[in-house]
């Protein structure tokens, strides 16, 4: 299963779309910066088997998809870009699911790393809480967009390391 190669390309396309989605100047949003506590340690370890690593990436993409599929998100972002972004994420999720099924027969380790997936879930809960507290303001969404771009970039490094391990 050559997921890391195809996923890396999808990740790049998703990042480009995210970059294009900006609606307001981020310079007006500096005071809205927030520490979401990206679970870096979950993307640092080499302890993962491939299926486990993919399941953590899958959770991150799934949570991002959920976040940008809300009605508040639809009211904020330009519709055609949002649709392209959602389609790209959906394709990545499908690719990952197919890949995990393939890997199950190859590995004897557990399919999921429960602690890592929980850490990713909590990270997105903090993002959602921040948006709620900021009443889904344009600046709050701008900060979240920047954070998601950063987390995608950090997970890209993780994917590249995964590819080198193969």
């Amino acid at each position: 299963c050559d997921l890391p190669q195809t996923h890396s390309l999808g990740n790049r396309r998703a990042l480009i779309l995210l970059a294009q989605m900006g609606r307001i100047s981020p310079f007006s949003c500096l005071k809205d910066r927030h520490d979401f506590g990206f679970p870096q340690e979950e993307f640092d370890g080499n302890q993962f088997q491939k299926a486990q690593a993919i399941s953590v990436l899958h959770e991150m993409i799934q949570q991002t998809f959920n976040l940008f599929s809300t009605k508040d998100s639809s009211a904020t972002w330009e519709q055609s870009l949002l649709e392209k972004f959602s389609t790209e994420l959906n394709q990545q999720l499908n690719d990952m699911e197919a890949c995990v099924i393939q890997e199950v027969g190859v590995e004897e380790t557990p399919l999921m790393n429960v602690d890592s997936i929980l850490a990713v879930k909590k990270y997105f809960q903090r993002i959602t809480l921040y948006l709620t507290e900021k009443k889904y303001s344009p600046c709050a969404w701008e900060v979240v967009r920047a954070e998601i771009m950063r987390s995608f970039s950090l997970s890209k490094i993780f994917q590249e390391r995964l590819r080198r391990k193969e």
């Epitope: 900006g22 500096l30 910066r33 920047a146 954070e147």
Partner: antibody, heavy 121, light 107 residues
Framework: EVQLVQSGAEVKKPGESLKISCKGS????????IGWVRQMPGKGLEWMGI????????AYSPSFQGQVTISADKSISTAYLQWSSLKASDTAMYYC??????????????WGQGTLVTVSS | DIQMTQSPSSLSASVGDRVTITCRAS??????LNWYQQKPGKAPKLLIY???SLQSGVPSRFSGSGSGTDFTLTISSLQPEDFATYYC?????????FGQGTKVEIK
């Protein structure tokens, strides 16, 4: 290794134009903003302005608005600071530094080595 | 614009001394404050960001505290290489502004 490398020292006459550069390497150039800071001889640090290289959006300090222009060419990972008509009072050391934008990360964590601009008739 | 006022503007201290520099903002900036060290002829170096986070590679004798309008940079035991000028900078809103600097000299 993250690096910001600035162009060399310049000696100019009043009224001349100038464009100095700051080339980033070792990181994703469009993921960080680039700020410019002035330091006049024997004085403190003054923030001039900033650019988001991903879309060339800029913000200036009111003290420098209209006096300088900040630009970037993301294809060569380079930011620029330019003057159309230099004054003797522009004599200073100019630094570029990277800024994490809206991300919760260290501000101005890497700096260029500085470009000394001397304006004298 | 947010004004940043540092005190003292200069101080004399000996190796091993505990040194404290303060920075006051003209309005609340939450914890959006950075501290830089600059030596003659060199670019500034980030020491502390978001008021109290130690930048990677910076010795633990440097620490920062404060929130709102009042902030402090502390050097717990001054070393020979710490004689320099220190600047605070608010990163709460544009235009970004620096304090006027505090020069730490050898007594």
């Amino acid at each position: 290794e993250v690096q910001l490398v600035q162009s060399g020292a310049e000696v100019k006459k009043p009224g001349e134009s100038l464009k100095i550069s700051c080339k980033g390497s070792g990181y994703s150039f469009t993921s960080y903003w680039i700020g410019w800071v002035r330091q006049m001889p024997g004085k403190g640090l003054e923030w001039m302005g900033i650019i988001d290289p991903s879309d060339s959006d800029t913000a200036y300090s009111p003290s420098f608005q209209g006096q300088v222009t900040i630009s970037a060419d993301k294809s060569i990972s380079t930011a620029y600071l330019q003057w159309s008509s230099l004054k003797a009072s522009d004599t200073a050391m100019y630094y570029c530094a990277r800024h994490p934008g809206l991300n919760w990360a260290p501000d101005f964590d890497y700096w260029g080595q500085g470009t000394l601009v001397t304006v004298s008739s | 614009d947010i004004q940043m006022t540092q005190s003292p503007s200069s101080l004399s201290a000996s190796v091993g001394d505990r040194v404290t520099i303060t920075c006051r903002a003209s309005q609340s900036i939450d914890g959006s404050l950075n501290w830089y060290q600059q030596k003659p002829g060199k670019a500034p170096k980030l020491l502390i960001y978001f008021a109290s986070s130690l930048q990677s590679g910076v010795p633990s004798r440097f620490s920062g505290s404060g929130s709102g309008t009042d902030f402090t940079l502390t050097i717990s035991s001054l070393q020979p290489e710490d004689f320099a000028t220190y600047y605070c900078q608010q990163s709460y809103d544009f235009p970004l502004t620096f304090g006027q600097g505090t020069k730490v000299e050898i007594k």
